[in-house]
């Protein structure tokens, strides 16, 4: 004969535990039902009656099966530098993440407590580490043969154009100026931008190049004094 299914509340066998979605009530000394997500325990179980559950009130939630007497309060509304990526419902807390161009400087269990604007690299410096949802941009000086003429949290240093005849040599913050209208390199127009960090997915892809057999002439130019260590602006 099949074993008889025990209905809550019931006294567990010695040494055994309560089943999934049940909890052991110390007062009643019985296995009792938990409340489903979105509910809380309005009345605890006794030896003869099971847990009575009730729905969470507005702006409160429970995410797990539980027997808490009160639902948890949803977090406060998202600040102006944040976006709400998950609304407050009876079953889940509000989640605030940083808006594009910002990163989370102080995280909490879910979402972000404090957002800060991504550092912007000033001219002569480029992004050497893109910002992510949780980390700031790192700026580094443009290497010989490359430049950045922008103040940006996304632009990397780009190679100088190669001129048939150079009118003005390029430097770390300015591209070379050619006397002819046909520089020898073909490049996509405009500055190269790094993608802004995305809250919902980690961004991907950029590769790592390798070693040169011999340095190109661009690298043989005198390097001059090292630029200031801080290649960023606060805004």
């Amino acid at each position: 004969l099949p074993a008889q299914v025990a209905f809550t509340p019931y006294a567990p066998e010695p040494g055994s535990t309560c089943r999934l979605r049940e909890y052991y009530d110390q007062t009643a000394q019985m296995c009792c039902s938990k409340c489903s997500p979105g509910q809380h325990a309005k009345v605890f179980c006794t030896k003869t009656s099971d847990t009575v559950c009730d729905s969470c009130e507005d702006s409160t939630y429970t995410q797990l099966w539980n027997w808490v007497p009160e639902c948890l309060s949803c977090g406060s509304r998202c600040s102006s530098d944040q976006v709400e990526t998950q609304a407050c419902t009876r079953e889940q807390n509000r989640i605030c993440t940083c808006r594009p161009g910002w990163y989370c400087a102080l995280s909490k269990q879910e979402g972000c407590r404090l957002c800060a604007p991504l550092r912007k690299c000033r001219p002569g410096f480029g992004v050497a580490r893109p910002g992510t949802e949780t980390s700031d941009v790192v700026c580094k000086p443009c290497a010989p043969g490359t430049f950045s003429n922008t103040t940006s949290s996304t632009d990397i240093c780009r190679p100088h154009q190669i001129c048939n005849v150079v009118a003005i040599p390029g430097n770390a913050s300015m591209d070379a100026v050619c006397t002819s209208t046909s520089p020898t390199r073909s490049m996509a127009p405009g500055a190269v931008h790094l993608p802004q960090p995305v809250s919902t997915r980690s961004q991907h892809t950029q590769p790592t190049p390798e070693p040169s057999t011999a340095p190109s002439t661009s690298f043989l130019l005198p390097m001059g004094p090292s630029p200031p260590a801080e290649g960023s602006t606060g805004d």
């Epitope: 992510t132 490359t146 790094l194 950029q206 590769p207 790592t208």
Partner: antibody
């Protein structure tokens, strides 16, 4: 002249650790990340990680997160890679480099051969 | 973990021909903003960075090398192969906080 000079070949037993060095000259080490990349015999390139000598911040490939430690000594313009719990699959040539993919500053060390054998 | 797949593994061509090498990201589209980089390795020589930012040639790299990105692929094109171009080529992609290399494409003389 920009140079990255790496330490000499190493032979180690499984389970041991090895510490490789890369001494740079011709540029300010704080201006560029130092990368470590390896190439096993007959295989492709594998990125181990990079270190920012300016502040010591590091980023590792997931496979090396627990076993590799990158450090720098800016007073001697030297970068270090320590790899622990060596196994035979770690037998490779290890390169330090300034090539970053963000910077176009394209210089590489001559490589250090590490052999792991019992 | 992200996987970067290069194809073909070996490409046999003659000098003067056009070479097209492909690199695919396992985690979604590779676009201009994803900064696919290409690196050349010749036996007994140092590595050489060719392309950065998906389509920018590194300083000193000849104009016959070009990069492009579309969908999940990024491509290195060598418009007219020179004898010195026969080598192994690697692409590498940045995945949020680390680089991943492809397995490489060996470009050999037919």
């Amino acid at each position: 002249e920009v140079q990255l000079v790496q330490s000499g070949a190493e032979v180690k037993k499984p389970g041991a650790s090895v510490k490789l060095s890369c001494t740079v000259s011709g540029f300010n080490i704080k201006d560029f990340y130092i990368h470590w990349v390896r190439q096993a015999p007959g295989q492709g390139l594998e990125w181990i990680g990079r270190v920012d000598p300016e502040d010591g911040n590091t980023e590792y490939a997931p496979n090396f997160q627990d076993r590799a430690t990158m450090t720098t000594d800016t007073s001697t313009n030297t970068a270090y890679l320590e790899l622990s719990s060596l196994r035979s699959e770690d037998t490779a040539v290890y390169y330090c480099s300034t090539w970053d993919g963000f910077s176009y500053f394209d210089y590489w060390g001559q490589g250090t051969t590490v052999t792991v054998s019992s | 973990e992200a996987v970067v797949t290069q194809s073909p593994a070996t490409l046999s061509l003659s000098p003067g021909e056009r070479a097209t090498l492909s690199c695919r990201s396992s985690t979604g589209p590779v676009t201009t903003n994803n900064y696919a980089n290409w690196v050349q390795q010749k036996p007994g020589q140092a590595f050489r960075g060719l392309i950065g930012g998906t389509n920018d040639r590194a300083p000193g790299i000849p104009a016959r090398f070009s990069g492009s990105g579309s969908g999940t692929d990024t491509t290195l094109t060598i418009s007219s192969l020179q004898p010195e171009d026969f080598a192994v080529y690697y692409c590498a992609l940045w995945y949020r906080n680390h680089w991943v290399f492809g397995g490489g494409t060996k470009l050999e003389i037919k």
